[in-house]
């Protein structure tokens, strides 16, 4: 069976029907369907006016405008809001009421595309294997990234989150149109990795998506990850404005100027240094989502009631931090280079800058405890990787799972740890599953390009597709059309159960309480440490316009050091892609299969971004609820700075009015959007037009300042900020 031309809200579209084997099965593939009008720089997306005739949807469209790997030119296009659909078909009738899985790509909110890197003439995010093996519809799409997707002044002039609104437009388009392709509009699952996993999480928390999303899967990234929310967007907006010659004194004039600046110039005005960094990489990526008071109405920690009816899977790779650790400390991948205590202490102190000397020392002590028994270089290097994995991925993911569980009504929660080791031949043998290593298995690459893989890789891929697609069908990864290797139990706050995904899976693959000691450390001990002033913060960053790599703003510290600005002395990004240069490990949108990535892949590992650190953690293991950090009277997470406020305020921590107590057991869910003293604030109505929900009307220039909450009701703790 095949669909032929399909009528959508924009008009007729015609894809390609690809036959699969001799049994008569096939897949209808539609590439490049517009889901919004061509974008205007730094404006909300608008509906597509439609077309006449039949749109031939046979080729991927260009990615959204972004810097190339070398960051000295751009590729992609401003006209980029297109989606792709894979619909599995049986022999006789066209498919009806299939579950729908919408993929959101990663790439640090800085790069990537809905089709992903091209490897052996097979695109990374080609949905065919998932669609045909799992009997689901797969949708991928482009969204704006970098300054064009996320530049914000932190106020109504440039509210930001344009890329998130693009994602929402795609989700809403699918909801309205997918029935015509044989999909069930009431069974939409979002899934994504890294910045895509965080985006999935943010979409479930946004009031705009009420009623659109049934289930969600976050792979190596959640809304609470420390690199996801930019707390000082004005700082970064001014840096770009200065670079392109816009005035920075008045936010309104700056915004108007930025809107009419050549989008390519805006894109190139921002560069991420990838070597010789003074601070960890995560501090240098400035254009990420913001709390705009509208699309993201409050700190994500306070929005989990919005996801109460959405089934959720979240997990990480066991060495997600490896690629970032190896950039922050290149000795990690070099057998002839050593990691010293001094190196590690410096790294730790850079992550814990807002907690000063005590934060650095305590953290260092906790992580180096095993070094006395095992002083081997392998153990030390693993420690560095574990440290970055914990901070950037694992701890935030655990909290997100606990928040989801605590707020869920009927919704189920599942956790996983992906441990199938990386196949990058240049890595040391001890390296486990690196960041983005999971993507190839979810997308069935061991089947699509079998020559690059082993039977055990196909086993892993088959299991992941089975779990993922069963979950999309039923909300339970064990139940559906696909057999699974072992039973995956739900996550609860009592058991903290997670499934370890490896090549050999059985009943012992269900585990409990992952890295409990470190989880407790970050959420209790570290959180309780007093925040220091900028004079006490260590280490001291370089200043001035020296050729030294510029220092980014560091979390909520009161100083905002200078971030990278274009022509800094930062070394160029290692060339990759078609250049014949040595391959760069897969990340975000690359994630290419085992053999070193080639083709147009190989995006260098751009880190997760933002300015914060690992958030506090849920109850774990057998301990019952964790001890509660001291709480002041306020209970409200700090409001991000707006206007010309300069560096971000230090959030209350430790004894100074620390975050409110996390609910445990049966305690009430937090308000949806904290507003004054109300018990629960109503969720604003939805809309996909780029316009905010009513009361604000139109596509309101005004993004209200995020609401604060004066109530003393128990709420989720604010995220730890480094």
């Amino acid at each position: 069976a095949k669909l032929g031309a399909v009528y959508t809200e924009g008009g007729f579209v015609e894809g390609v029907n690809k036959k699969l084997g001799l049994l008569g099965d096939s897949v209808d593939i539609f590439k490049g369907i517009p889901f919004a009008a061509p974008t205007k720089a730094l404006e909300n997306p608008q509906p597509h006016p439609g077309w006449q005739g039949t749109l031939k949807a046979k080729n991927f469209k260009k990615r959204c405008l972004q810097a190339t790997i070398t960051q000295d030119s751009t590729y992609g296009d401003e006209d980029c809001l297109y989606l792709n659909i894979w619909v599995p078909q049986g022999r006789k009738q066209v498919s009806r009421d299939l579950p729908v899985m919408i993929w959101i790509y990663g790439g640090a909110f800085l790069m990537g595309s809905g089709h992903g890197a091209n490897f052996l003439n097979n695109y990374l995010y080609d949905g065919e294997e998932i669609a045909t093996r799992g009997n689901v519809i797969v949708v991928t799409f482009n969204y704006r990234v970098g300054p064009l997707g996320f530049l914000s002044t932190g106020d109504a002039n440039l509210p930001g989150n344009y890329g998130l609104r693009d994602q929402h437009m795609a989700i809403a388009w699918v909801k309205r149109n997918i029935a015509a392709f044989g999909g069930d509009p009431n069974n939409i699952t979002l899934f994504g990795e890294s910045a895509g996993g965080a985006s999935v999480s943010l979409q479930t928390l946004s009031p705009y998506n009420k009623g659109l999303i049934r289930r969600a899967i976050s792979q190596s990234g959640v809304a609470l990850s420390p690199w996801v929310i930019q707390k000082n967007p004005l700082f970064w907006a001014k840096k770009v404005a200065e670079k392109v010659g816009c005035p920075v004194g008045d936010a309104a004039r700056m915004a108007q100027c930025l809107k009419v600046t050549d989008p390519r110039a805006l894109t190139l005005a921002y560069k991420v240094p990838l070597a010789g960094l003074e601070y960890p990489m995560l501090h240098y990526v400035g254009f990420v989502p913001v709390i705009d008071g509208d699309f993201i109405p409050a700190d994500p920690i306070n929005l989990y009631a919005n996801a109460a009816d959405i089934d959720y899977i979240a997990g990480t790779n066991n060495m997600d931090g490896h690629i970032f650790a190896s950039i922050d400390m290149p000795a990690i991948n070099k057998g002839n280079k050593k990691v010293t205590e001094e190196d590690f202490y410096k790294l730790v102190s850079e992550f814990t800058i807002t907690k000063g000397l005590r934060g650095a020392k305590t953290t260092f002590d906790v992580y180096t405890e095993s070094w006395a028994q095992d002083p081997s270089q392998e153990n030390k290097k693993k420690t560095v990787v574990d440290f970055e994995t914990d901070v950037l991925f694992l701890v935030p993911t655990e909290i997100a799972l606990a928040q989801h569980r605590a707020n869920a009504k009927s919704a189920k929660t599942y956790a996983y740890l992906f441990s199938h080791p990386s196949r990058m031949p240049v890595y040391p043998k001890w390296v486990g599953a690196d960041h983005a290593d999971d993507i190839q298995y979810v997308f069935g690459k061991p089947f699509a390009t079998p020559t690059g893989y082993r039977p055990q890789d196909r086993t892993v891929s088959k299991a992941m597709i089975a779990y993922w697609t069963n979950f999309a069908k039923t909300g339970d990864p064990n139940m559906g059309d696909s057999a699974v290797p072992t039973h995956w139990e739900p996550y609860t706050t009592e058991n903290s159960g997670y499934l370890e995904i490896t090549k050999k899976m059985g009943s012992s693959s269900m585990k409990r309480s992952l890295r409990t000691n470190f989880l407790r450390y970050w959420t209790l001990t570290y959180l309780a440490l007093p925040t220091v002033t900028d004079q006490e913060a260590t280490p001291v960053p370089p200043t001035g316009d020296s050729e030294a790599t510029p220092v980014p703003p560091t979390g909520d510290s009161e100083t905002a050091p200078v971030p990278p600005t274009g022509d800094s002395g930062a070394p160029p990004v290692p060339p990759t892609g078609d250049s014949g240069a040595p391959p760069v490990p897969p990340t975000g949108d690359s994630g290419a299969p085992p053999v070193p990535p080639t083709g147009d892949s190989g995006a260098p590992p751009v880190p997760p971004t933002g300015d914060s650190g690992a958030p506090p953690v849920p109850p774990t293991g057998d301990s019952g609820a964790p001890p509660v950090p001291p709480t002041g009277d306020s209970g409200a997470p700090p409001v991000p700075p707006t206007g010309d406020a300069g560096p971000p305020p230090v959030p209350p921590t430790g004894d100074s009015g620390a975050p409110p107590v996390p609910p445990t057991g049966d305690s009430g869910a937090p308000p949806v959007t904290p507003t004054g003293d109300s018990e629960t604030a109503p969720v604003p109505p939805t809309g996909d037009s780029g316009a905010p929900p009513v009361p604000p009307t139109g596509d309101s220039e005004a993004a209200p300042v995020p609401p604060t909450d004066d109530s003393k009701e128990a709420q989720m703790p604010a995220v730890i900020r480094f």
């Epitope: 032929g4 031309a5 399909v6 009528y7 959508t8 809200e9 924009g10 008009g11 007729f12 015609e14 509906p47 597509h48 006016p49 439609g50 077309w51 006449q52 005739g53 039949t54 809403a172 388009w173 909801k175 309205r176 149109n177 029935a179 015509a180 009623g211 659109l212 939805t686 809309g687 996909d688 037009s689």
Partner: antibody, heavy 119, light 105 residues
């Protein structure tokens, strides 16, 4: 100027079929989708389906699937809507309507064809 | 399918009055169109894409809204405006509201 001229009123028995025509003029026939909408006496408007005159692609509302067929004749710039297995509740005025631009605002309408289904 | 609900279903007003008709979608939509129909006549496109007027439609007609809530406003009723008004959403299966009959008071 754009004109859509429909065929005359029809009286049909239950179980029969009816074929209504809509002749277009004043624009390039193959450049715009043609929709069919009906209105039962004293009732609101109901979308039946759409045809792309350039390639004959069609899409029908779920309710009419299997009973409606839309075709076109590019040589005469005419579209046809055939509805089979008629029942009394199909008694209505049937309109053809052309897209205004892009998709979906129905900018130009035929005068309507009354189809009466009665035994 | 997306359901469209208009309110009120009928209303009486006088020449010169300002009149507002609302249309609510059961879930978020991208575009909304408004039509005017007089007895025995075919509908006529009045507003498209929520707020845009086709050429020839008087400027006393205006539309607004996004997402799920939309309004049609006639700023100063004229005798020729007494008719039935329909909203319509654009999706892969377009649907109309049930209509609002505007009568002379």
């Amino acid at each position: 100027q754009v004109q859509l001229v429909q065929s005359g009123a029809e009286v049909k028995k239950p179980g029969a079929s009816v074929k209504v025509s809509c002749k277009a003029s004043g624009y390039t026939f193959t450049s715009y989708n043609m929709h069919w909408v009906r209105q039962a006496p004293g009732q609101g408007l109901e979308w039946i389906g759409v045809i792309n005159p350039s390639d004959g692609a069609t899409s029908y509302a779920q309710k009419f699937q299997g009973r409606v067929t839309m075709t076109r004749d590019t040589s005469t710039s005419t579209v046809y809507m055939e509805l089979s297995s008629l029942r009394s509740e199909d008694t209505a005025v049937y309109y053809c309507a052309r897209d205004y631009y892009g998709s979906s605002p129905l900018g130009y309408w035929g005068q309507g064809t009354l189809v009466t289904v009665s035994s | 399918d997306i359901q469209m609900t208009q309110s009120p279903s009928s209303l009486s007003a006088s020449v010169g009055d300002r009149v507002t008709i609302t249309c609510r979608a059961s879930s978020s939509i991208s575009y909304l169109n408004w039509y005017q129909q007089k007895p025995g006549k075919a509908p006529k496109l009045l507003i498209y894409a929520a707020s845009r007027l086709p050429s020839g439609v008087p400027s006393r007609f205006s539309g607004s809204g996004s997402g799920t809530d939309f309004t049609l406003t006639i700023s100063s009723l004229q005798p020729e405006d007494f008719a039935t008004y329909y909203c319509q959403q654009r999706s892969s299966s377009p649907t109309f509201g049930q209509g609002t009959k505007l009568e002379i008071k």
